[in-house]
């Protein structure tokens, strides 16, 4: 039977009255333009809503914006536009919300053309009050908070100046000119690239990479001939132009740019690109674009130094035109990533890895689904997930895949079941085990969100017609109940819930359209009375993650350890609560060769788990140098996979080889680096 129509469905009784008492409507007293929402802080209940309306006149654009504040998760809003002197706020900069629970907010205002600088409104009390500050520059980017200290802000100006504030935007100082890109690193460090001659675009590949660790008092040039740079986990990456031609290569530093190593990755030409898909403190997923406008490339995974890379996935979809990739970190289960590959026939297929890129497979066909017409075999096919690429192609997919770290194992996504992604109307599928198995959850496209750490899933149909119904499930999407939240249907634009999936409130956003006007409206529904009691010990069950063969002693071992979780039983209708913490019990596994990758100069022959020394270290792909200078490189041929915690078992040892004579690099050696002070 279809999802939600099962006789055994554990229905929530009398839910209509319970939800009706907890449904709060707010009509925004302005014309429908655009609306943006921001949560200020975690568990504070404070939401800021900025509505903007543009009227393009002949000579200029007339704009109007309004600012609203809620402190009860969106049940009630107060118009606080007067706190910002009724100023028009620039939506392209959004609302810059401070890190953690700093309560800081920066709004960037639109100012008239002739002014000396821009204007910002600053709040450090969760938007209760704002201070107007006129800037000595016109901002080009949103204000960026230092992750370590929310009083420290940086911004780029339209004149390419790098500006820093040490007192939360009260005073600003230009610390450098001719800056292209700036990023906060750790410990209040700022990394930025500068151009010497014409402009950022003209000097691409001839930029310098600079660092300041004292907010602009002193500087150090840590790289030259830079094309671009990026930060991921504890790694600093720079793509650097080669001496002889127009190709460039990735260099990596793990000490904030003091020393660099050339990454063992293919070099790329002018039309190609590198992209850091994901990074943590252990390793990096790097996409290297294929030559030509193919729309695909190769994923490589790094070792713990970010230097040695293993080929992970071929023909990885990543369009050059729109810059779209479907690469998704499934945050509800360790080691799981989903992405798309481009087949020879130009169709798109979904692949999943459960071991951080070690092996990729197709997604298992959902039990309750039939293969669509893309399938060559009616009974054998896979689930293919619609993500960023499908959204960019307007394939009737309103949302990307969704997973939350505190809703263990749950993944929700639009998909089609066949040999490839289909252009037919997608359905919504759910996995409760991190992507190993899937079930059709809802027919047709929907918006969806996870509440109460997975205790409730809420969905709304994606339709061009006005809607007045939402659906909710208390058993991880097996059974659904519908609630009519208003008599008058609205044109639905989205579901909004507090980031982190701990809340029990959901806001339904949309607009009403009458003969003359259309207005924004929100309905906030609190599900607290649906989940009447707090969950107890009996409501949870033990679940072994990554379990595929319970008979096997090593069952569940991924990256050297297995984890048992306490998970809410599907039949339990209770509150995990805002303070819910995922309970997990890790246990270490014995090492096997699967827990090691081949070190530089070694490779794995196909269908062999042993690493064999490469006969010669020649070819661009293996140019390699440690810490920017020739150095005695010792290796036993194997390196533990980053993040792998296995112990005992197989412990491969190889004799030490001296590879220094084969080592080259064209990057800055430490003696070429220079420092200067302001």
């Amino acid at each position: 039977s279809a999802p939600g129509e099962d006789e055994e469905c554990g229905r929530v009784r009398d839910f209509v009255a319970k939800l009706a008492n907890n449904t709060h409507q707010h009509v925004f007293d302005d014309l429908r333009g655009s609306v943006s929402l921001s949560w200020v802080g975690d568990s504070t209940g404070v939401i800021l809503v900025l509505t903007t309306f543009h009227v393009p006149l002949v000579i200029m654009t007339f704009g109007q914006s309004k600012l609203y504040r809620s402190e009860d998760y969106g049940k009630n809003f107060k118009d606080i536009t007067d706190l910002i002197n009724n100023t028009f706020i620039r939506t392209e900069f959004g609302m810059a919300i401070g890190p953690e629970n700093s309560g800081k907010v920066v709004l960037t205002a639109e100012v008239s053309g002739g002014s000396r600088g821009g204007r910002i409104f600053r709040s450090s009390d969760f938007a209760k009050n704002f201070v107007q500050t006129d800037l000595p520059f016109h901002p080009l980017t949103q204000m960026m908070y230092s992750p370590q200290n929310s009083d420290y802000l940086l911004a780029l100006s339209t004149e390419n100046g790098l500006w820093v504030s040490k007192n939360f935007g009260g005073k600003w100082e230009e610390i450098h000119k001719a800056v292209c890109l700036a990023k906060w690193g750790s410990d209040n460090t700022i990394f930025f690239t500068t151009y010497a001659n014409g402009s950022c675009k003209a000097d691409l590949g001839a930029l310098e990479l600079w660092r300041t660790s004292d907010l602009g008092k002193s500087f150090k040039t840590i790289g030259v001939k830079i094309y671009s740079f990026g930060l991921g986990g504890r790694f600093l990456f720079a793509s650097v132009m080669a001496d002889k031609d127009t190709t460039r290569r990735i260099h990596v530093s793990t000490d904030q740019g003091d020393t660099w190593s050339m990454a063992q990755l293919p070099s790329v030409g002018q039309e190609q690109f590198y992209s850091i898909l994901a990074a943590n403190d252990d390793m990096v997923f790097m996409h290297v674009d294929e030559p030509g406008d193919t729309g695909f490339g190769t994923i490589f995974t790094s070792d713990d130094r970010g230097i040695v890379y293993s080929k992970s996935l071929d023909r990885h979809l990543y369009t050059t035109t729109g810059g779209e990739t479907d690469f998704t970190n499934v945050t509800s289960l360790r080691g799981v990533y989903i992405t798309s590959v481009l087949s020879e026939d130009n169709s798109i297929q979904t692949m999943i890895t459960f071991d951080q890129g070690g092996r990729w497979t197709h997604l298992r066909k959902p039990e309750n689904s039939e293969c669509d017409a893309t399938a060559k075999n009616k009974n054998e096919c896979s689930l293919h997930i619609h993500a960023s690429y499908s959204i960019s192609q307007k394939l009737n997919v309103p949302m990307a895949p969704l997973s939350e770290p505190n809703a263990v194992g749950i993944v929700i996504a639009h998909g089609s079941v066949g040999d490839a992604i289909s252009v037919m109307v997608p359905d919504v599928y759910i996995s409760d085990d991190g992507g190993y198995s899937w079930t059709k959850m809802l027919e047709g496209p929907h918006y969806y969100t996870i509440l109460d750490s997975g205790g409730i899933i809420v969905a709304a149909e994606h339709s061009s017609r006005p809607i007045n119904v939402i659906k909710f499930s208390t058993d991880e999407g097996q059974c659904w109940q519908t609630y009519t939240f208003t008599r008058d249907p609205i044109y639905f634009t989205g579901l909004a819930s507090e980031p982190g999936a701990r809340s029990m409130n959901i806001s339904i956003w949309g607009f009403t359209e009458s003969f003359l006007t259309s207005q924004w409206v929100s309905y906030t529904i609190d599900f607290k009375d649906i989940l009447e009691r707090n969950c107890e010990e009996k409501d949870y069950t033990i679940w072994l993650a990554h379990s595929t063969d319970p008979e096997d002693y090593e069952d569940g071992c991924i990256l050297g350890y297995k984890e048992q979780f306490l998970r809410l039983r599907k039949s339990s209708v209770c509150q995990n609560g805002r303070d819910y913490v995922v309970t997990k019990q890790p246990s270490i596994c014995l090492c096997s060769l699967e827990d090691f990758l081949c070190d530089f100069g070694y490779y794995r022959p196909e269908n062999d788990s042993k690493c064999v020394e490469q006969p010669e270290l020649k070819g661009h792909d293996l140019e390699f140098c440690l810490y920017g200078r020739e150095e005695h490189l010792t290796t036993n041929g194997y390196r533990k996979i980053p993040g792998d915690k296995c112990q005992g078992g197989v412990n491969p040892v190889r004799e030490v080889k001296d590879l220094k004579k084969k080592c080259t690099s064209n990057f800055l050696s430490p003696e070429k680096q220079n420092s200067k002070s302001n």
Epitope: D419, V423, M424
Partner: antibody
Framework: QVQLVQSGAEVKKPGASVKVSCKAS????????MSWVRQAPGQGLEWMGI????????SYAQKFQGRVTMTRDTSTSTVYMELSSLRSEDTAVYYC??????????????????????WGQGTTVTVSS | EIVMTQSPATLSVSPGERATLSCRAS??????LAWYQQKPGQAPRLLIY???TRATGIPARFSGSGSGTEFTLTISSLQSEDFAVYYC?????????FGGGTKVEIK
């Protein structure tokens, strides 16, 4: 030459089912998808769904989901369309049409649509009590 | 689903004249569009595919243009056998959808 020959007219009572056949000849049967399109009296064309003759897998328009079943027999190069729980609104001419393009979403190279290039002569289905 | 809107519903043209038929999609269909001709009591016949390519055996007086949401079928000089109903159809997103048709009749 390439042709699609459909079964003869049918008269059915409401609630009954009808099964229309479409025999392909003059080309490799498994090399092209087959769509079914219907046309109510005096109305326009309405697409019902598509079948992949290679494995017999199907995709249906949501409107017909649960009521329509498309199958094929490769030994006779024939596709079938069965519509159940018939109502008077199902009175129409039903066409099979060769649909070369399939339904896989294109990657970055644009998908190219070749159109339904060969049609059956149509089967009239009348639903009346 | 993508809604295809054809205009005009009826077009009265004299033989030898030019006929221009319009088809609009509710969202972009790229060039995944076909035009069909249907005469009374007959099955539709493919005229144009890929928005602008003539199907095999279709006379040169039929031409298709457009991409995205706006498409045109032009019959440069109407012959007596061209009086029929013309349908556009998109295959960008499932379900495939047809326009309501334009009837080209003798003026």
């Amino acid at each position: 030459q390439v042709q699609l020959v459909q079964s003869g007219a049918e008269v059915k009572k409401p609630g009954a089912s009808v099964k229309v056949s479409c025999k392909a000849s003059g080309y490799t049967f498994t090399s092209r998808y087959m769509s079914w399109v219907r046309q109510a009296p005096g109305q326009g064309l309405e697409w019902m769904g598509i079948i992949n003759p290679v494995g017999g897998s199907t995709s249906y328009a949501q409107k017909f989901q649960g009521r329509v079943t498309m199958t094929r027999d490769t030994s006779t190069s024939t596709v079938y369309m069965e519509l159940s729980s018939l109502r008077s609104e199902d009175t129409a001419v039903y066409y099979c049409a060769r649909d070369p393009s399939g339904i896989a979403a294109a990657g970055p190279a644009s998908r190219y649509y070749y159109g339904m290039d060969v049609w059956g002569q149509g089967t009239t289905v009348t639903v009346s009590s | 689903e993508i809604v295809m809107t054809q205009s005009p519903a009826t077009l009265s043209v004299s033989p030898g004249e030019r006929a221009t038929l319009s088809c609009r999609a509710s969202q972009s269909v790229s060039s995944n569009l076909a035009w069909y001709q249907q005469k009374p009591g007959q099955a539709p016949r493919l005229l144009i595919y890929g928005a602008s390519t003539r199907a095999t055996g279709i006379p040169a007086r039929f031409s298709g243009s457009g991409s995205g949401t706006e498409f045109t079928l032009t019959i440069s000089s109407l012959q007596s056998e061209d009086f029929a109903v013309y349908y556009c159809q998109q295959a960008r997103l499932g379900p495939w959808t047809f326009g309501g048709g334009t009837k080209v009749e003798i003026k």
